[in-house]
């Protein structure tokens, strides 16, 4: 299983650091159903 | 009109594979992340995982990592879901989410 | 896993009052960039679900201001100050602290 780190912000997923609970101004749509920038 | 279409309802014998397809209609789907997750009948929510159409990273609930894989065509805008060695217990309607549009959903039965 | 519990399961209402629903997670979901990481979702009767409050107190776009949520870093409430006839439906709570997890949902019909 993945180990969380969220003092950090951050979860170690297979070895790689991905920032999973992203800032809502992230343009790419982590929040499911949000609706995010300009339809392109 | 912006919208996900995914493919229809399947039937599976325990064992098989599925692919189940979410195409976006009037929206570029590179540009957003992909979610999947599943209803199974009469119960709630579940998040499958997520995939970065852009670079084909993907995050995965540990629960779906061997059963599920995440894949993007971005040449059709068409996100993929294959699930194997399906059991019954996979029974579900599954959707496909990007930005703030959701597929209408996919029956997918596993049954003998 | 961040459990999410809900109650009621079941809420009968009646048009015009006002209702609420309860959320617990087994975790705190306030991070320490002070954002708290739960949502609302509503399911209607054959459709698929939708976004109705991110990040426990922000409204979705087109969501109706008579739903509101407030909450600590584990408990939460939804609470619609005068129900209408199509607010019925599955309403979950979810978090994404940890991945994502939902609640067993909490049914509200029209009493």
């Known amino acids: 299983d993945a180990e969380f780190r969220h003092d950090s912000g951050y979860e170690v997923h297979h070895q790689k650091l991905v920032f999973f609970a992203e800032d809502v101004g992230s343009n790419k749509g982590a929040i499911i159903g949000l609706m995010v920038g300009g339809v392109v | 009109q912006v919208q996900l279409v995914q493919s229809g309802a399947e039937v599976k014998e325990p064992g098989a594979s599925v692919k189940v397809s979410c195409k976006g209609s009037?929206?570029?789907?590179?540009?957003?992340?992909v979610h999947w997750l599943r209803q199974l009948p009469e119960k709630g929510l579940e998040w499958i995982g997520r995939?970065?159409?852009?670079?084909?990273?993907?995050i995965y609930t540990p629960k779906f990592q061997d059963k599920a894989t995440l894949t993007v065509d971005t040449s059709t805008d068409t996100a993929y879901m294959e699930l194997s060695s399906l059991r019954s217990e996979d029974t579900a309607v599954y959707y496909c989410?990007?930005?703030?549009?959701w597929g209408q959903g996919t029956l997918v039965t596993v049954s003998s | 896993d961040i459990v999410m519990t809900q109650s009621p399961l079941s809420n009968p209402v009646t048009p015009g009052e006002p209702a609420s629903i309860s959320c617990r997670s087994s975790?705190?979901?306030?991070?320490?960039?002070?954002?708290?990481?739960l949502y609302w979702y509503l399911q209607k009767p054959g459709q698929s679900p939708q976004l109705l409050i991110y990040?426990?107190?922000h409204l979705a776009s087109g969501v109706p201001d008579r739903f509101s949520s407030s909450g600590s870093g584990t408990d939460f409430t939804l609470k619609i100050s005068r129900v209408e006839a199509e607010d019925v439906g599955v309403y979950y709570c979810?978090?994404?602290?940890?991945?994502?997890?939902f609640g067993q949902g909490t049914k509200v019909e029209i009493k």
């Open positions: 995939i970065d159409p852009e670079n084909g990273e993907t």
């Open positions: 009037g929206f570029n789907i590179k540009t957003y992340y």
């Open positions: 975790k705190s979901l306030l991070h320490r960039n002070g954002k708290t990481y």
């Open positions: 990040q426990m107190d």
């Open positions: 989410v990007s930005s703030g549009y």
């Open positions: 979810a978090q994404n602290l940890e991945l994502w997890t």
